[in-house]
């Protein structure tokens, strides 16, 4: 009965050639989709001459599919029983699936003269980089195509720098073509508790972003966990688009196509600040626009973006501190659409569908130097778009799990 | 006291060039942005060109036609101005400046070194 | 390009007069605002810097006041020692520029 189960499960989950899970794992038979909802802004001007608050609209859905591309360089190392791969990234446009085309036009903040501005304090170089700003012709805000924004342009304004600087921007470029990774993980057989768990990432065991345990990276990628999955566990994984390791926690049963599965999500605790949860200490990495490390439900990545104000958050800025978005105008955050979740089969610890959801923000700062920036009186942590990342077990995949998996145990 | 001691300076003909030097007495020039500022005979100030702390930013007025070139040697605390195809409206004081601490620009200045340009 | 227009040209002030030089901007530069005197024979001091900011060790005789475009810089004694050319400096944005100059004089 239950230890031949076990023995079964053992042996399937191992990620090594000619096992269910490894079938699985180096091409998932999921489809994959991210949804954009892009932030279009309202009111650049007034934002920009009386630094009124920022009027934001959501628009979207606009679907890609993603992940669909199969693991490369796929190296098993019995020595200490890991198998190394890369995640290729690629992104097909959907667009039965979205409400307009890749052409569809949005006011962002112009991303090239935010970063600028922050990466280069100096005023010496602020007036030299404002030269160039007014030469090119562009300003706080900016008009640009879901394409442009999402996959990258030429700025105008960066390609006159005289200086040996990338002149593509874009919130994912570069992407297509591109790969995460090196991931090393525990393939689980010496030990299945450890099936999945990352060893190493871009060969070291820590990010180098954070202080203290903050850097470590921790659990899986979040595609499965080690089997025999338990209501009290806290669900540790890595996910390289926050730049951090993050943890779910049991919220509730779910009944997923005739398949029992766990539900974890992502707790507010998790996003909290220091003061509420003083384990986040090592997430606060400045003090003066988290007020002293006071704020939260916002994630300085700077650090890992080559010195971009980039901020991650929830959609809508769920979980966050008043002042946060008391400068945003627009924004409804609401749990159910916002949160992020798991849905875990327990036994296998395959993670059968998931809604991974998290935003973009941009960090733009008043700079008497920088004439499109001056007349700002106040920071501004500007939502650019929102993701959700959504995944299901096929009906087919259901049916076999149910027959193989479940309907054994029951 | 910051000190900053220009040399390199003197009489040319149109078309040569010149290089000229300021060797810095402080311990930070690394840390500072600095600059290169002329005086003309009839009394004007002008912003000859500037660099930023590591030398990876430099900045020329479009009407110095890119004939000077700003550098610095961080290691020899010492600024330099390569002057090429040197013209007579080109004679003037040339004074090395250190900015200041928050951004100021010219907060320091040298003695000056002349350089004259006479057919 | 800000043009900065400096007058008077020169001037001729008794000591304990008070001094007035004024700079005007072609466009808003805030108080970016920068004042050098220059001695004969010295280098350029930067006596006032922007935001009216009196640098260290300046006498408190000195100051400057002015916003957007009109800028005005006072010594409210003169003294015998304060005979120099006077310039403005505007630092709000590239090309750099300075007033023609101020040569002011005993009487």
């Known amino acids: 009965g239950d230890m031949l189960i076990q023995k079964t499960i053992k042996k399937e989950v191992v990620l090594e050639e000619g096992t269910i899970a490894f079938k699985n794992w180096v091409k998932t038979g999921t489809e994959i989709y991210r949804q954009f909802w892009i932030f279009d802004v309202q009111n650049p001007q007034e934002v920009m001459m009386n630094s009124s608050n920022i009027q934001v609209k959501q628009r979207g859905p606009y679907t890609y599919r993603v992940r669909f591309l199969a693991k490369e360089n796929i190296t098993q190392d019995p020595k200490d029983n890991t198998v190394s791969f890369l995640q290729p990234n690629g992104a097909i446009f959907e667009p039965s699936l979205s409400v307009g085309t890749e052409a569809d036009n949005f006011t962002v903040l112009n991303l090239a003269v935010a970063a600028a501005s922050h990466i280069y304090p100096n005023p010496f170089v602020q007036v030299v980089l404002n030269s160039l700003i007014n030469k090119s012709k562009s300003s706080m805000f900016q008009v640009r195509t879901l394409r442009e924004l999402l996959w990258g342009y030429t700025d105008p304004f960066l390609s006159l720098v005289p200086y040996p600087v990338s002149t593509r921007v874009g919130m994912f470029y570069p992407y297509n073509n591109t790969a995460d990774g090196v991931y090393k993980v525990f393939n689980g057989k010496d030990s299945i508790s450890k099936v999945a768990i990352i060893d190493t990432y871009k060969g070291k065991r820590n990010l180098s972003y954070w202080e203290s345990y903050c850097d470590m990276i921790n659990g899986t990628d979040a595609a499965s966990f080690p089997p025999f999955v338990e209501k009290s566990q806290v669900l540790q994984f890595f996910s390289s688009d926050i730049c951090r390791s993050i943890y779910a926690v049991f919220e509730s049963d779910v009944n997923l196509k005739g398949i029992p599965v766990y539900r974890f999500v992502l707790p507010s605790k998790a996003f909290a600040s220091p003061v509420q949860n003083p384990d986040n200490h090592c997430f606060c990495t400045e003090k003066i626009i988290s007020k002293n490390c006071t704020s939260y439900g916002v994630l300085d990545i700077s650090k890992c973006k080559e010195g971009k104000p980039v901020y991650i958050s929830l959609p809508h800025f769920l979980y966050a501190s008043p002042d946060v978005s008391e400068t945003i105008d627009g924004l409804n955050p609401n749990e159910e659409e916002h949160r992020t979740y798991l849905d875990i089969e327990p036994i296998t610890g395959f993670t059968l569908q998931f809604a991974k959801r998290l935003q973009v923000n941009l960090l733009v700062k008043p700079s008497n130097k920088i004439q499109v920036l001056k007349r700002l009186k106040r920071n501004y942590i500007v939502p650019i778009l929102w993701l959700n990342e959504t995944g299901t077990i096929g009906d087919e995949k259901a049916k076999m799990f149910r027959s193989q998996v479940t309907g054994k145990i029951n | 006291e910051v000190q900053l001691v220009e040399s390199g300076g003197g009489v040319v003909q149109p078309g040569e060039s010149l290089k000229l030097s300021c060797e810095s007495n402080?311990?930070?020039?690394?840390?500072?942005?600095m600059s290169w500022v002329r005086k003309t005979p009839e009394r004007r100030l002008e912003l000859v060109a500037a660099i930023n702390s590591d030398g990876a930013i430099t900045y020329y007025p479009d009407t110095m036609e890119r004939r000077f070139i700003i550098s610095r040697d961080n290691t020899k605390k010492t600024l330099y101005l390569q002057m090429s195809s040197l013209k007579s409206e080109d004679t003037a004081m040339y004074y090395c400046a250190r900015h200041g601490q928050t951004g100021t620009w010219f907060a320091y200045w040298g003695q000056g070194t002349l350089v004259t340009v006479s057919a | 390009e800000t043009t900065v227009t400096q007058s008077p040209a020169s001037l001729s002030m008794a000591i304990g007069e008070k001094v007035t030089i004024r700079c005007i901007t072609s466009t808003d530069i805030d108080d970016d605002m920068n004042w050098y005197q220059q001695k004969p024979g010295e280098p350029p001091k930067l006596l006032i810097s922007e935001g009216n900011t009196l640098r260290p060790g300046v006498p408190s005789r000195f100051s400057s006041s002015g916003y957007g475009t009109d800028f005005v810089f006072t010594i409210e004694n003169m003294l015998s020692e304060d005979v120099a050319d006077y310039y403005c400096l505007q630092s709000d944005n590239l090309p750099l520029t300075f007033g023609a100059g101020t040569k002011l004089e005993l009487k």
């Open positions: 402080e311990y930070e020039f690394p840390s500072h942005d």
